[in-house]
Interface confidence: medium
């Protein structure tokens, strides 16, 4: 399953300013997500693209528009999570419904929670619209279930 | 002004379901706030339930173990607490609130609904 | 889950008296702590955010002091609308919990 790491890890600590548009839990992120042995906290993150169109080339990692879209979603992620804490995401899916998107995001422990990670992305969608051009909506978040299968996933939050 | 109105009290049998509602006016519920829902059995100090998101999603206190499924219906801007599997601890007020920010992008309750008293009794 | 304990449970004073109650976390929250006062059969009201920050409408005689793992409300001097529960209450992590409350009744 294609992964994307981040290129930066580092912590935000108890006192550290997020950009103006992200509203943080508390002015101290922490986390009760699911976390491994290893410290990380794992989130499934479900949205749809409206203004795009699934076909079979969604279900092929070969495939020009498969790569392109993997490519612009993991962009837009290391953009929205460009505070410290975000180690990647993985387990991208893309299912009908125009284009329904379903991935795995990992953090470091302690860095943020699972009200953040949606506030964040939702205050994202419409720069993403202008710099992407992915109209976004339905946007869902939960943590993810541990232990969890890092080949199927999480299952579709209820 | 924002104001939360919740659903009139109920009695219920013990292993029946529960739906509280919460209409909200003067704020939209898909909008920059998060709406939770707490709850005070009598005489007793408050227990936060969980919340639904603005942009959807959920989150519950666990110590709930899965009873408790929060719904909303975007179009009446209202939010929905339902608590299956009901016992005689779980009569309390329950009450919803919105989870607001400040200028300086820090979470607290400012605005809370009246309070619904559900009885849970054979 | 952070646990939040208050003291005293029940507080008797007199109109007029200096009041204080004190909220003690756990764990480490910094100043993720507010403060609600509650009459019977009524939701909470908002008087102190992060420890120490006023509420727009809030009287000046309630403020709030602490970080880390102690924190006090302070009633500069108790008016007769005063008489009320308070709790305490941490949104440092999830869960949300909040204090068991002090009751401030007629001494």
């Known amino acids: 399953t294609p992964t994307t790491l981040a290129s930066h890890s580092t912590k935000t600590d108890a006192s550290s300013t997020h950009h103006s548009s992200v509203p943080p839990l508390t002015s101290s992120n922490h986390s009760t997500s699911p976390q491994l042995s290893t410290g990380v906290s794992f989130f499934f993150l479900s949205f749809h693209i409206s203004n795009l169109q699934f076909n079979s080339s969604l279900e092929d990692p070969s495939t020009d528009y498969y790569q392109e879209l993997q490519r612009d979603i993991s962009e837009m992620f290391l953009q929205i999570y460009k505070q410290g804490g975000f180690l990647g995401l993985s387990n991208i899916k893309f299912r009908p419904g125009s284009v329904v998107v379903q991935l795995t995001l990992a953090f470091r422990e302690g860095t943020i929670n699972v009200h953040d990670v949606e506030t964040q992305f939702n205050q994202y969608k419409t720069e993403a619209a202008s710099r992407y051009n992915l109209t976004i909506s339905d946007v869902s978040v939960s943590d993810v279930p541990f232990p969890f299968s890092a080949q199927s996933g999480a299952g579709v939050p209820g | 002004e924002i104001q939360l109105v919740q659903s009139g009290a109920e009695v219920k049998k013990p292993g029946s379901s529960v739906k509280v509602s919460c209409k909200v006016t003067g704020h939209s519920i898909t909008r920059g706030s998060s709406w939770h829902w707490m709850r005070q059995a009598p005489g007793q100090g408050l227990e936060w339930i969980g919340y639904?998101?603005?942009?959807?999603?959920?989150s519950y206190n666990p110590s709930l173990k899965s009873r408790a499924t929060l719904t909303r219906d975007t179009s009446t801007n209202t939010f929905y607490m339902e608590l299956s599997s009901l016992r005689s601890e779980d009569t309390a007020f329950y009450f919803c609130?919105?989870?607001?920010?400040?200028?300086?992008?820090?979470?607290?309750?400012?605005?809370w609904g009246q309070g619904t008293l559900v009885t849970v009794s054979s | 889950d952070i646990q939040m304990t208050q003291s005293p449970s029940t507080l008797s004073a007199s109109v007029g008296d200096r009041v204080t109650i004190t909220c003690r976390a756990s764990q480490n929250i910094g100043t993720s702590i507010h403060w609600y006062q509650q009459k019977p059969g009524k939701a909470p009201k908002l008087l102190i955010k992060?420890?120490?920050e006023s509420i727009s409408g809030v009287p000046s005689r309630f403020s709030g002091s602490g970080s880390g793992t102690e924190f006090t409300l302070t009633i500069s001097s108790l008016q007769p609308d005063d008489f009320a529960t308070y709790y305490c209450q941490q949104n440092n992590n999830w869960p949300l919990t909040f204090g068991q409350g002090t009751k401030v009744e007629v001494k």
């Open positions: 609130a919105r989870y607001s920010y400040d200028i300086t992008y820090r979470w607290f309750f400012d605005v």
């Open positions: 992060y420890a120490s």
């Open positions: 639904i998101h603005y942009g959807g999603g959920t």
